[in-house]
Amino acid sequence: APFDDDDKIVGGYNCEENSVPYQVSLNSGYHFCGGSLINEQWVVSAGHCYKSRIQVRLGEHNIEVLEGNEQFINAAKIIRHPQYDRKTLNNDIMLIKLSSRAVINARVSTISLPTAPPATGTKCLISGWGNTASSGADYPDELQCLDAPVLSQAKCEASYPGKITSNMFCVGFLEGGKDSCQGDSGGPVVCNGQLQGVVSWGDGCAQKNKPGVYTKVYNYVKWIKNTIAANS
């Protein structure tokens, strides 16, 4: 993929078209959050991305142009984690059941759930259509990508004293300059082909000593599987 390090996702690059086939856009008249397709009929996103009506857009690259690979499917069920806490953003995870099955192809496909927790130092891919400016507003039309490492839980907790639960982890750069941002929420953090994280929160975007905070999907695999089974 062409690399442009000036101001994407913040500090990322334009993803190669449809190179993140599990990435979805949640739309309510505008893109407001991302998500990840985990099977033909289910999407994982962030709990704080809850809205009563959501259209899930799959196969997107440029969200402002119909490019021919898109599938727009309304949400049939939107299930936020029962212990989601708006104040702390603990348990910031949500499942969306599509009203019809997605057609799986080269441009729309699923991502695997994790089989082990994220290991410190692992390089991950974060993607989304969120703000590309660390201050101000510059929302891209084309999907942005960022390669970033998993930080140790100690560094994560030191960056956000008293705010990091066991259901959260940090990914990014303590020096700042590269991070997810507003509009990336709910989107994927994929490490070694597994969905390890969901974009959740942070103190600003790309600020020094304030890395991005992500929901630890590994802790919710059982809940995800049970919820899908109970709603199939």
């Epitope: 704080h48 910031d92 703000n131 101000g136 507003a137 510059d138 507003q182 974009v199």
Partner: antibody, heavy 125, light 107 residues
């Protein structure tokens, strides 16, 4: 259906306080925020402040800082706006309006899709 | 603070006319702009959100466009019920700010 119903008109003396209520129905109160907007006679719209219904986080217009307090009561799905040390130029119609939450790294969009009917506050000696 | 400048402040038009109202932000706000219609003695009503998305129940003769700093509200064929005051609002950052309003009057 989704609606916001505000308390009735008030007449106050300069220096007094007023508290306007806004009762929400037809949606989950804590999934949204409430903004307060006022409109003086013959004038345009002036934003006063914003409150998260779930966390009670607030953001006030600078010119009203120290005089305005916004609160919510989640048990009754009601938002309140109190304005103190009233002056004659506070005479206006006060509106509450529903908007998106500002939370996490969700898209930051703070438009207002549902409005209350308005509460007339007259400040006169 | 982001200043919103609306023009014109008033426009006289006839039923069936195409009416265009512009709104300029003092700094870039991406697509985060809303348009409201207000009739005398009534609360504002949301017409357009996120610059170009039509609010449910609003007639398709209303449309919005723009991104960054320059935005437009267009009424393709003015109807008698459209005579009102229209406001833009930046929905990108606090403090929320409104344009000064455009009054659409009968010619």
């Amino acid at each position: 259906q989704v609606q916001l119903v505000q308390s009735g008109a008030e007449v106050k003396k300069p220096g007094a306080s007023v508290k306007v209520s806004c009762k929400a129905s037809g949606y989950t109160f804590t999934d949204y925020a409430i903004s307060w907007v006022r409109q003086a006679p013959g004038q345009g719209l002036e934003w006063m402040g914003w409150i998260s219904a779930s966390t009670a986080d607030t953001n006030y217009a600078q010119k009203l800082q120290g005089r305005v307090t916004m609160t919510t009561d989640t048990s009754t799905s009601t938002a309140y706006m109190e304005l103190r040390s009233l002056r004659s130029d506070d005479t206006a119609v006060y509106y509450c309006a529903r908007g998106d939450e500002v939370v996490g790294k969700r898209t930051y969009y703070i438009g207002m899709d549902v409005w209350g009917q308005g509460t007339t506050v007259t400040v006169s000696s | 603070d982001i200043q919103m400048t609306q023009s014109p402040s008033s426009v006289s038009a006839s039923v069936g006319d195409r009416v265009t109202i512009t709104c300029r932000a003092s700094q870039g706000i991406s697509r985060w702009l809303a348009w409201y219609q207000q009739k005398p003695g009534k609360a504002p009503k949301l017409l357009i959100y996120a610059a170009s998305s039509l609010q449910s129940g609003v007639p398709s003769r209303f449309s919005g466009s723009g991104s960054g700093t320059d935005f437009t509200l267009t009424i393709s064929s003015l109807q008698p019920e459209d005579f009102a005051t229209y406001y833009c609002q930046q929905a990108n950052s606090f403090p929320i700010t409104f344009g000064g309003g455009t009054k659409v009057e009968i010619k």
